[in-house]
């Protein structure tokens, strides 16, 4: 009775198309392959980012895989072939490991990258990343930035630089079309006479970097004798109003009374009749329904009444 | 519409060079191996290079090894093959060709160029 | 190196009739044989790899068969724009080898 053996895939790279961290991992068929035919072979994939704890695995029938890495690290990745038990009379049988890397060769020394990277998502509508230089580098180092997601067909450049004596500082975005939920690449490389500077790669979601304008036209409605029901409007601008939650802070009398977080653009109040005068601010932010993470906007325009009855007024700002 | 188009072939004399491309349209460069096979004048077909995917794995026919380099640049779809040393029993029309890609096999060619002519004469 | 010895060099034949090509690899190659058409001034056009799988496109009538050493493509009915030159490939491991090529030519 024979041993039953595969070999290992055949020609496994890691192949950079230039999507700044999107790689694709690719394979052959391992040779003699034509014996199994009858058989769907399978493969086990493993890869990490060099010095993380844990592999990422996948068990598939194609050739290929694609996921995003952190360019700042190596990528290591192994994979072998599978013969599922039907094939085999029995037991499922494993190739050999096939083995390989890919790391991006780093250009000057750390300290020479962009330093303090900020981006953020103003309104759902614009995005604005900012940096400031690497330590020790001259005037004469410039930066660039480019990025790629998914429906892109190639990495772009920043067309519109916000500059610092002459250095570019940060990118004003244009529309970014379909850019949400899903994986947003950033390469910031720079270019000096004098030394290498290192290039710093960025991965993040668009949706988590939102920070939407405050809430507008915060209005007082007396409710009852001791309810006050704060209202306010969702911001202009793309989110709806599903997305976002609230943060209140309601001074009565100079005393912070209440600071409360809350899903609709209500609010109600339990006042006294000896309240003389009541304000309120408002911030909004993304709520978890449609992202991960988010930004608080600035506080909205404090809207106050001041001395006069509640119960006659409602108040407009 | 995949396509293949190879450029740079032309009259080269004994122990000359000569640098063809071939430019790659249609499809997911990247993501396939390439090749050049050569037809001689006696319609011979002559497997000559293979270029991986991603470039970590290159392979030579020994009439060429030592001589010809096969090169890619997934950034441009281009493909490259730099004769050197050329004889002249390197006159053939080369062709760029890409490696099919299938769950069972991948070595053998399902598109292929129009071809470019390299004589090798004095 | 594997060889592989395509017979015949060449053949005549009619419209309508069943035409049978044969390559014979120098070891054995599993099921890794293709089967190419050039057509004069042409490219090489893949008609079948893997011995039996026929290439996207390709008319049923031309079908592949065969593992080990002995492989055969087999065109059911000759159609006028089936005159060509037929070559076999194995794809089994490097180097790649072709056989010399059939030139199926009118009766």
């Known amino acids: 009775d024979t041993e039953i053996k595969v070999n290992p895939p055949q020609d496994f790279e890691i192949v950079d198309p230039g999507y700044l961290g999107y790689l694709y991992l690719q394979w052959q068929p391992p040779l003699s392959l034509d014996h199994f035919k009858e058989c769907t072979v399978e493969y086990e994939l493993k890869y990490r980012n060099i010095g993380s704890e844990t592999w990422k695995t996948i068990i598939t029938k194609n050739l290929h895989y694609k996921d995003g890495f952190d360019l700042n690290k190596g990528i290591e990745a192994k994979i072998h072939t599978l013969l599922p038990w039907q094939c085999t009379n029995g037991s499922e049988v494993q190739s050999s490991w096939a083995e390989t890397t890919y790391w991006i060769s780093p250009q000057g020394i750390p300290e020479t990258k962009v330093q303090d990277m900020d981006c953020v998502y103003y309104n759902w509508q614009y995005l604005l990343c900012s940096w400031k230089p690497g330590i020790g580098v001259l005037l004469d180092t410039n930066y660039n930035l480019f990025y790629w997601y998914e429906g892109l067909d190639h990495a772009l450049q920043c067309v519109d630089y916000i500059k610092a004596d002459g250095q570019n500082i940060g990118c004003r975005f244009p529309y970014l079309e379909a850019s949400d939920y899903k994986d947003f690449y950033i390469c910031v490389n720079g270019s000096s006479e004098n030394k290498p500077i290192r290039s710093s790669y960025f991965t993040f979601q668009l949706q988590n970097i939102v920070k939407p304008l405050p809430p507008v036209y915060l209005t007082f409605t007396r409710e009852s004798s001791c309810e006050i029901k704060l209202k306010w409007s969702i911001p202009l601008g793309p989110i709806p109003a599903r997305c976002f939650d609230y943060e209140i802070e309601i001074r009565e009398d100079d005393t912070t009374l209440v600071t409360a977080t809350v899903e609709n653009e209500t609010y109600t109040l339990k006042t006294t009749n000896e309240t003389r005068q009541l304000c309120f601010v408002v911030r909004s932010k993304v709520n978890i329904y449609c992202s991960d993470d988010g930004i608080w906007s600035e506080w909205s325009d404090k809207q106050c009444w001041e001395g006069e009855d509640l119960s006659k007024k409602t108040l407009l700002r | 519409e995949v396509q293949l188009v190879e450029s740079g072939g032309g009259l080269v004399q004994p122990g000359g060079s000569l640098r063809l491309s071939c430019a790659a349209s249609?499809?997911?460069?990247?993501?396939?191996?390439m090749s050049w096979v050569r037809q001689t004048p006696d319609k011979r077909l002559e497997w000559v290079a293979t270029?991986?995917?991603?470039?970590?794995?290159?392979y030579y026919a020994d009439s060429v090894k030592g001589r010809f380099t096969i090169s890619r640049d997934n950034a441009k779809n281009s493909l490259y093959l730099q004769m050197s040393s050329l004889r002249a029993e390197d006159t053939a029309v080369y062709y760029c060709?890409?490696?099919?890609?299938?769950?069972?096999?991948?070595?053998?060619?399902?598109?292929w160029g129009q071809g470019t002519l390299v004589t090798v004469s004095s | 190196d594997i060889q592989m010895t395509q017979s015949p060099s060449s053949l005549s034949a009619s419209v309508g009739d069943r035409v049978t090509i044969t390559c014979k690899a120098s070891q054995d190659v599993g099921t890794a044989v293709a089967w190419y058409q050039q057509k004069p001034g042409k490219a090489p056009k893949l008609l079948i790899y893997s011995a039996s799988y026929r290439s996207t496109g390709v008319p049923s009538r031309f079908s592949g068969s065969g593992s080990g050493t002995d492989f055969t493509l087999t065109i059911s009915s000759l159609q006028p724009e089936d005159f060509a030159t037929y070559y076999c490939?194995?794809?089994?491991?490097?180097?790649?080898?072709f056989g010399g090529g059939t030139k199926v030519e009118i009766k």
């Open positions: 490939q194995h794809h089994y491991s490097a180097p790649w080898t």
């Open positions: 270029v991986s995917s991603g470039g970590s794995y290159i």
């Open positions: 060709a890409r490696q099919g890609t299938t769950a069972l096999a991948t070595r053998f060619f399902d598109v």
């Open positions: 249609g499809f997911t460069f990247s993501r396939n191996g």
